[in-house]
């Protein structure tokens, strides 16, 4: 039975040109995390495999950085980065858990939400 839950940063905003950390956390389960995929509307951004390390999609390698932890750092943000992001946790023995984050990239400097996950 899948007892775990994914906690995410929820709806966050950041400034154009800035950076943001996407974070998910799996709790309430003893299942072993074997791999975490990060996707943006069906497009793979990155994979963090417990044994193989990180795979960053070549299309994003110049502005996506692995971590911290199982999270993902998006850099040089553009308005086109606005949208849904998904963390997909592959676990043993539970199976797959999915978390959702909505990122809004703002033209102005009004980026109050999720400030603790921003990189200055």
């Amino acid at each position: 039975m899948m007892t775990g839950t994914i906690e995410t940063t929820g709806n966050i905003s950041a400034e154009k040109g800035g950076s943001i950390i996407l974070q998910c956390h799996l709790s309430s389960t003893t299942a072993q995390v074997t791999q975490v995929n990060w996707e943006q509307q069906d497009q793979l951004l990155a994979i963090c495999n417990a044994d193989l390390g990180w795979h960053i999609s070549p299309s994003f390698k110049d502005r996506v950085a692995p971590g911290p932890g199982l999270g993902l750092t998006l850099q040089s943000l553009t308005v086109n980065d606005t949208g849904e992001y998904f963390c997909i946790y592959h676990t043993y023995p539970d199976g797959t858990y999915t978390g959702r984050i909505f990122l809004e990239v703002l033209e102005s400097s009004v980026a109050e939400h999720g400030a603790r996950f921003q990189i200055p």
């Epitope: 994979i47 495999n49 193989l52 390390g53 070549p58 390698k61």
Partner: antibody, heavy 119, light 107 residues
Framework: EVQLVQSGAEVKKPGASVKVSCKAS????????MHWVRQAPGQRLEWMGR????????KYNEKFKSRVTITVDKLSSTAYMELSSLRSEDTAVYYC????????????WGQGTTVTVSS | DIQMTQSPSSLSASVGDRVTITCRVS??????LAWYQQKPGKSPKLLIY???TLAEGVPSRFSGSGSGTDFTLTISSLQPEDFATYYC?????????FGPGTKVDIK
């Protein structure tokens, strides 16, 4: 056109080391991880390890961990695989292979380098 | 390590035949499976990744299916250039491992 061109065949004595090179062209070298895979005569393919050419970070198959070193030279877009303490069972064709867009599989392969270990 | 088995180990077929190769994996790898074609003296060529996604430039007669532990490669209508050895590979954990191969030859 993506190309991975490997160094030529090698004959080595048991206990020696071999260093195989793989020169990449036709794409941005630092954007794609590189794998090394070998194939002994009549055997299945065997994965040895992978490297991120951008950071130099690598991961190895535990079976080879103490004997294999994978490195890159970003300036020349070349990956290297060095295998030490060679034994006859290391006689194989060694391949470099570029990691694909969407995971840890390999989408382009070098032509292979035959390494023969014989006394 | 994740163990990979393939069946059959070899098969004889004619041009135009439908050919099916099976790959069985020792544990759940979701859809993280690739298929490669290798001809004698040549490098492997990627056919399929993520169990069912056709690699660039690969003819549509090749298809892949399956998830979890059981996977299939199908060639809908065998062509002369398809006579080769086919390998499955999981791309899910360390070490990445390959199946023993299935040799497809001319009947």
């Amino acid at each position: 056109e993506v190309q991975l061109v490997q160094s030529g065949a090698e004959v080595k004595k048991p206990g020696a080391s071999v260093k195989v090179s793989c020169k990449a062209s036709g794409y941005t070298f630092t954007n794609y991880y590189m794998h090394w895979v070998r194939q002994a005569p009549g055997q299945r393919l065997e994965w040895m390890g992978r490297i991120d050419p951008d950071s130099g970070g690598s991961k190895y198959n535990e079976k080879f961990k103490s004997r294999v070193t994978i490195t890159v030279d970003k300036l020349s877009s070349t990956a290297y695989m060095e295998l030490s303490s060679l034994r006859s069972e290391d006689t194989a064709v060694y391949y470099c292979a570029r990691e694909g867009h969407y995971g840890f599989y390999s989408d382009y392969w070098g032509q292979g380098t035959t390494v023969t270990v014989s006394s | 390590d994740i163990q990979m088995t393939q069946s059959p180990s070899s098969l004889s077929a004619s041009v135009g035949d439908r050919v099916t190769i099976t790959c069985r994996v020792s544990e759940n790898i979701y859809s993280y499976l690739a298929w490669y074609q290798q001809k004698p003296g040549k490098s492997p060529k990627l056919l399929i990744y993520n169990a069912k996604t056709l690699a660039e430039g690969v003819p549509s007669r090749f298809s892949g299916s399956g998830s979890g532990t059981d996977f299939t490669l199908t060639i809908s209508s065998l062509q002369p250039e398809d006579f080769a050895t086919y390998y499955c590979q999981h791309h899910y954990g360390n070490p990445l491992t390959f199946g023993p191969g299935t040799k497809v030859d001319i009947k």
